[in-house]
């Protein structure tokens, strides 16, 4: 070909390349510009899809090669661009030109049945000429050129039942067929390209033609009489046997229902197994060999679905007789209970009676039964059973604290037939006996200051007991009778704890470094048990503020939650408070009306200073000023944001006398008036009345100020809502209230 372009142009030869060339590279042709007269140095470039991969050009000569085998069926046309460059100038000598490489077709594809192998279904007994299916082959060759892709269909296998249309590939039935005779036909169809001419490729497809079922056959029992057996020990619902009426049809056309036509005693029933189409004869009532040894029933099988077109083939049902023999059975002994629950107290002597199990042989009342215990290899034998009468006894005393329940398995065996064995579980509960004395719940390190005053709490103690801790389990604490110690007293808190108090003063490390207090702890078991536990009290050298200087100084400080720095701060506060309280005592007799009921004995010995005056918005949310206007001070539950306030605590001697509440009333009234009248003054909401002590608390008072002994008006029900961590606290407060009420 020659392309003229203003007296300049491209010259090339071939632009066709046959597909499927087997050489590693195939010369397609040569690009050449007519300006290339041999005097110039021209470089030829190939551009476009396929350049450099499918097609390679020798840029020096313009020769184009196909370096891959080409497949027209994959791609039949390549559009490429050519460029010629003068080596001397590096410029294109003429415009880029587009050219086409066509891949020419060869008959290299066989016809293909892409959807094969084919499976078709046609109902049995269909009339002649019924279309079964259509097969279609495709040929990858060029359908627009020649006969490479033109196909003809023919039947290779399948006569005389089927035929195929040569051009369309439609398969038809040529005769009526019965599925019960043959349900599947293999038909082979051939497709040939080149319209069947010489050199044609062909392909075959197998068509599996299935004949679908129609209900043209009734059910049929194989026998007129069936024999079945049933054991007399068979429970109601037992399958006695299965019957099958055969139907040469399939699927729902073979589906049938079974009925019992004659069974006056109504002992047997029949159900249809939808999966297997069997009739399952089941026991509706227990049979007894001794009363009736043979039963006879009449069973009918009826097709569930009838096809109107084949009614003439009917009736679609069949009948048979089933004779059922009752088989005598030897049953194992039967325990009176499936499982037994027995009780025995712990500690009882070996050979004590636990309980009795009983089993009997239903087949023969005279037959004796032998009892035994199934012994686990790893278990200690704690029980034995009388093999004749089933009584279970202990083989050694039991300890509830080791195991509160024992599970054993007993067996009953027929003496005349040892193979007949039955089992029963026996659950033995070991009942608690108060056989453990109470003891301290932990080791106590107790200290007392040399300058301690009488009535000072030095230790709280509690006890534990290994016995069954029922809800009403109680411990009582007292000093052992043997001691004549006048130094300490034990106060039982009535809540399974006790407080150790100083009875006198004047302790001296020089005289006596340790005191050994024998504490008697009594439980409320039956009979009650006591134990004596020794509490060691160490005498400590303390300063006037009851701060231990020796005797594990650090540990003691830690126990009251104070660092040295905190102690200094507390002492400073103490001086201020002393001045304040002296002033209150001086004026005390002037006022007799009380805001709080005063009980001196309720005063505690700890002073706690709460430095949280006037917290602004934080406090406004936390306090209700209206509470200050009421005579009875109520504790209302209000949410308060978490405010960390430093609480300084220090021990000091009990004042033994409470301040006059009238002074407080006057003080509150003045401050309240000031807050109500002067808008510049912040709400006077920092008065905090600590008149409510948790008397049930083991920790004792937080405050050394006197407390209102009557907090009956308080409602502690909200504590219950605080969840499991506060369960014990809630129990203490709510139970206290209920006992008061």
């Amino acid at each position: 070909d020659y392309k003229d372009d203003d007296d300049k142009g491209w010259v090339w030869n071939q632009f066709f390349v046959p597909e499927e060339m087997n050489t590693t590279s195939h010369h397609i042709g040569q690009l050449r510009s007519d300006l290339d007269n041999g005097n110039n140095s021209f470089q030829y470039k190939l551009l476009g899809a396929g350049a450099g991969s499918t097609f390679i050009i020798d840029e020096r000569t313009g020769d184009i090669y196909a370096i891959q085998k080409l497949d027209r069926e994959e791609r039949s046309l390549y559009i490429l661009r050519a460029q010629v460059i003068d080596i001397a100038t590096g410029r294109a000598v003429e415009p880029e030109s587009e050219f086409v490489i066509k891949v020419s077709d060869i008959n290299d594809h066989e016809p293909q049945f892409l959807d094969g192998p084919y499976v078709a279904t046609v109902p049995e007994m269909s009339p002649e000429g019924t279309s079964v299916t259509q097969v279609t082959a495709t040929d990858g060759d060029d359908p627009s050129y020649g006969n490479n892709a033109r196909l003809l269909y023919s039947l290779i296998q399948g006569q005389p039942y089927f035929s195929v249309e040569p051009k369309t590939g439609v398969i038809r039935m040529t005769s009526q067929m019965d599925r019960e005779t043959k349900d599947q036909y293999l038909v082979v169809i051939q497709a040939k390209d080149m319209v069947g001419q010489a050199g044609a490729f062909s392909a075959t497809a197998t068509v599996t033609i299935n004949l679908s079922d129609v209900n043209d056959n009734p059910p049929k029992f194989q026998q007129r009489l069936y024999y079945l057996n049933v054991s007399e020990e068979a429970p109601v619902g037992t399958t006695v046997g299965r019957l099958l009426a055969e139907d040469s049809d399939i699927g729902e056309n073979a589906a049938m229902n079974y009925f019992i036509e004659e069974d006056s005693s109504d002992v047997f029933g029949i159900i249809t197994d939808r999966e297997t189409q069997e009739g399952i004869i089941i026991l509706k009532k227990r049979v007894d060999y001794e009363s009736k040894r043979k039963h006879s029933v009449r069973v009918k099988a009826v097709n569930r679905y009838i096809d109107d077109r084949f009614l003439k083939e009917g009736p679609f049902e069949d009948i048979t007789i089933v004779q059922i023999s009752v088989v005598d059975a030897d049953e194992p002994p039967v325990f009176t209970l499936e499982s037994y629950v027995m009780e025995i107290a712990e500690g009882v002597v070996s050979g004590s009676l636990v309980g009795t199990v009983s089993a009997r042989d239903l087949d023969n009342d005279d037959s004796s039964v032998r009892y035994s215990i199934v012994q686990g290899l790893h278990l200690k034998r704690l029980f034995s059973i009388n093999e004749h009468n089933g009584t279970i006894i202990t083989t050694e005393p039991l300890d509830r604290e080791k195991a509160s329940w024992h599970n054993i398995t007993v067996t009953a065996t027929e003496t005349r037939n040892p193979e007949k064995i039955s089992e029963a579980n026996v659950y033995i509960q070991v009942l608690d006996v108060n056989d453990h004395a109470p003891e301290f719940s932990k080791y106590y390190e107790t200290f007392v200051c040399e300058n301690a005053v009488p009535g000072q709490l030095i230790q709280n103690i509690s006890a534990v007991d290994k016995d069954d801790s029922a809800e009403n389990h109680r411990f009582y604490f007292s000093l052992a009778q043997a001691t004549n110690s006048s130094h300490f007293t034990v106060k039982d808190n009535q809540d399974n704890t006790a407080g150790i108090f100083t009875a006198g003063s004047g302790f001296s490390r020089k005289e006596q470094f340790y005191f050994f207090l024998p504490i008697l702890i009594l439980d409320n078991g039956s009979p009650p048990l006591t134990s004596t536990n020794t509490l060691t009290v160490t005498v400590c050298d303390c300063d006037t503020e009851v701060n231990t200087l020796y005797c594990r100084y650090g540990a003691f400080l830690y126990s009251i939650g104070l660092s040295t720095e905190a102690l200094v701060a507390v002492l400073a506060c103490l001086l201020i408070l002393l001045v304040f309280f002296l002033a209150i005592i001086g004026i005390r007799q002037q006022r007799k009306k009380t805001l709080f009921s005063e009980k001196v004995e309720e005063f505690r010995e700890n002073i706690v200073r709460y430095d949280d005056e006037g917290g602004g918005e934080e406090d406004t949310e936390a306090f209700d000023i209206s509470a200050l206007r009421t005579r009875a001070v109520l504790r209302t539950h209000k949410p308060r944001k978490k405010i960390t306030t430093e609480i300084h605590s220090l021990y000091r001697q009990s004042l033994q006398v409470g301040p006059d509440s009238a002074i407080f009333r006057q003080f509150i009234s003045e401050k309240l008036e000031e807050a109500n009248t002067d808008p510049s003054v912040p709400p006077y909401d920092s008065l905090q009345t600590y008149a409510f002590e948790g008397t049930g608390s083991l920790a004792g008072s937080l405050s050394s100020l006197g407390s209102n002994t009557s907090d009956v008006d308080q409602n502690y029900e909200y504590l219950v809502g605080w969840g499991p961590p506060f369960k014990q606290l809630a129990g203490m407060y709510t139970s206290q209230r209920s006992t008061r009420d």
Epitope: T24, S25, H27, S41, Q43, G52, I56, I57, D58, E59, R60, T61, D63, Y65, I67, D86, I87, A88, G90
Partner: antibody, heavy 122, light 108 residues
Framework: QVQLQESGPGLVKPSETLSLTCTVS????????WSWIRQPPGKGLEWIGY???????NYNPSLKSRVTISVDTSKNQFSLKLSSVTAADTALYYC????????????????WGQGTMVTVSS | DIVLTQSPGTLSLSPGERATLSCRAS???????LAWYQQKPGQAPRLLIS???SRATGIPDRFSGSGSGTDFTLTISRLEPEDFAVYYC?????????FGQGTRLEMK
Amino acid sequence: QVQLQESGPGLVKPSETLSLTCTVSGGSINSYYWSWIRQPPGKGLEWIGYIYYIGSTNYNPSLKSRVTISVDTSKNQFSLKLSSVTAADTALYYCARDSRYRSGWYDAFDIWGQGTMVTVSS
Amino acid sequence: DIVLTQSPGTLSLSPGERATLSCRASQSVAGSYLAWYQQKPGQAPRLLISGASSRATGIPDRFSGSGSGTDFTLTISRLEPEDFAVYYCQQYGKSPITFGQGTRLEMK
């Protein structure tokens, strides 16, 4: 490292065909141009022709009528056939690689074989 | 065909001296596609310079090439004993590829 090794008979009778093979080792023959160059004893170098790995060839016009260069990519070899030889064809024959990678204009010969001496004599 | 003429035919110099080899083309060499080779007795030629001035891999920098069109030069700035050999120029700007007749550089 790519190496070239020429092989073939050292003696060829006049009028017969000279056949030489160059084996490429240490690299692929693909994507390069491969040339034959000869050097008569005591004389200068003469380019005979090249073959591109796809089979494209270009020969020196002075020898074009007698020369055939072919390639066997599967063996990583290319060959020279020079027909109707005379004594003037006696020379040291070199195979060399054009340093141009992939198709493009000519380039210098960066890799050479050690050469094989062919004598044309009866 | 492009004819390449090298001069001088023989150049006698001592080690350490500067050598200048000339190559003249009968017509302009397109794209300065000119190369220089060194050949020692019993060895194949070794590429020194391509594209008139680009040193081949591993070639010492004492070798340099210059020129364009028809006149090209190979310069060895300071001769080493191993530099004494025959030097060929080659053009590849136009087919057929041609070589010069060579310049023998010998030790004085």
